[in-house]
Each structure stands twice: as C-alpha cells, then as structure tokens.
C-alpha cells in the first residue's frame, strides 16, 4: 500500500522539515527560513509562531517543530500552548476584574495564580483546628478533642491572623 | 488597526522626572487598557502600570509604588506615564500596549516601538 500511495503521490515522499514543492515538480523542499513542517506530505511549511511583547521564547522554532512561548515574569501562560499570559497575584490573593484582591477572612491562596478558597473545616472530620489559617495557608487540622486523653496537654491554637471585624478588600 | 506610539523617553538625572506619553490612533481608547513594560538591556522585559478603560490602575512592579502614576485622557486618546524620584535601575526601554483588560495579554495585543529612557548623572 506504501508503495502504491508513492507512486500516485510523490509528496507522501516529504519528510516533515520539508514540503512538496509544486512549482519544482513536486520535489521535496526543505522549508525556509522561519516556517517548520511537523509531518511528511505536506505542500506548504507553516510560518512559526513568534513570541512577542508579554511572550517571551521557551523553545525555538525549528524545521520540524513550531516555536514555543510562555510568559515574561510577573505572567503565566493560560490557554493551550499559552496562547495569553495573565497577570501573577501574590499569595494571599486572587485575580478579579479590578487587578489582585486580598484573599477575604476564611479563605486563602497558597499560589501566585487561581482564586482564594475556603479553610478546611476541621469539625468536619472531627478534629480540632492545631494552627489557624491565614490569607496565605489553610488551617491545620489536629486530633479530635476525644483524641486526648484527660491529662493530656491540648495545644493552644495561636491568636488568629486577622482582628475579628476584619472587612475583606 | 491600533497603533500605539509612545514619546517623552530622554536622558535624566537620578531623582528627576520624566513624562512618558502613549497615544493611541485607529481606535478609540474607551475600549481598551493600556499597559507599560520596559526592558532594561540583558533582561527580561517586565511590566510597570496598567490602567483600565473605567480607569482602574494595575501596578505590576513593587519598585516603581509611589513613584510612577499614570492617567488616561480618551478625548487625546492618550495614557501618560508620570516617573519621579527616577532611579539608575529604571534605564530601560519603555513599551506602550493596549490588551483588552490589565491582567490578560495576547498575542492579538498592540505594542510601539518603544522609548529610551536613561537614568545617569
């Protein structure tokens, strides 16, 4: 079958880097300068992607394989192949329509990206709160009351991270 | 199309000002935000302020807080970038773009050339 669909097409013949060249009887061209081929038969290369502005280059284009963006600092890449770059938030902080907010009292972010999320609810499971949480941290969970025994020391959670009262933003 | 150019780069000392303007022609500023970046020479490009088309400022660089403002004029169609207190380390070129929103760029976005701006004695 290989041989058949050579001999009927010639350009199943071009290896990716190159193109079937139909203006030099159907010869296989390599691709110039700034245009790749991912696989063979092709008739046309494609232009290779240019990492501009916010975009800065990962990996550079080649005959074979299109170039690679991601984000200048500050950025990371969102979309497939990082095809824009959204603004880093710091810790303790998620990205709304008005820029970078302070995570509000009972939620944290532990990432420069993604959006602020609830505490764990230790009573939950059945365990007591061991360190409170912050805009930053999630609280940690410690044994259930019932896990100590009556003389044993519990530890006292420390004061909590914000003024009761704290309005978010 | 937008084009945005920018203008007002020049030699300063440090502790001086300079006002960086970028004016944008081919489509109306109301739409969009606009953002400035600089490159220093042998690094990366980062970002400096960004403002809103309601007017909302993004500060993308702690080093420029409560030196750098920047504003909007829509009937100019233009953004100006105030520097003061300036520093050896703001050298760079600066580059005007217009994203749609502050905290998302494309590759569909619009840049200038960009300006020098230089911080000597």
């Known amino acids: 079958f290989e041989r058949t669909r050579s001999l009927q097409d010639p350009c199943s013949n071009c290896p990716a880097g190159t193109f079937c060249d139909n203006n030099r009887n159907q010869i296989c061209s390599p691709c110039p300068p700034n245009s790749f081929s991912s696989a063979g038969g092709q008739r046309t290369c494609d232009i290779c992607r240019q990492c501009k502005g916010v975009f800065r280059t990962r990996k550079e284009c080649s005959s074979t394989s299109n170039a690679e963006c991601d984000c200048t600092p500050g950025f990371h890449c969102l979309g497939a192949g990082c095809s824009m770059c959204e603004q880093d938030c710091k810790q303790g902080q998620e990205l709304t329509k008005k820029g970078c907010k302070d995570c509000c009292f009972g939620t944290f972010n532990d990432q420069k990206r993604g959006i602020c999320r609830p505490w764990t609810n230790c009573s939950l499971d059945g365990k007591s709160v061991l360190v409170n949480g912050t805009k930053e941290r999630d609280v940690v969970c410690g044994p259930s009351p019932a896990d100590l025994s009556p003389g044993a020391s519990s530890v006292t959670p420390p004061a909590p991270a914000r003024e009761p009262g704290h309005s978010p933003q | 199309e937008v084009q945005v150019v920018e203008s007002g780069g020049g030699l300063v000392q440090p502790g001086g000002s300079l006002r960086l303007s970028c004016a944008a022609s081919?489509?109306?500023?109301?739409?969009?935000?606009i953002g400035w970046f600089r490159q220093a020479p042998g690094k990366e490009r980062e970002g400096v302020l960004c403002?809103?088309?309601?007017?909302?400022?993004?500060i993308y660089a702690d080093s420029v807080k409560g030196r750098f403002t920047i504003s909007r004029d829509n009937a100019k169609n233009t953004v100006y970038l105030q520097m003061n207190s300036l520093k050896p380390e703001d050298t760079a070129v600066y580059y005007c773009v217009a994203p749609r929103i502050c905290s998302t760029y494309s590759s569909d976005d619009y840049w200038g050339q960009g300006t020098q701006v230089t911080v000597s004695s």
């Open positions: 081919g489509s109306s500023l109301d739409y969009s935000a």
């Open positions: 403002i809103s088309s309601s007017g909302d400022v993004t």
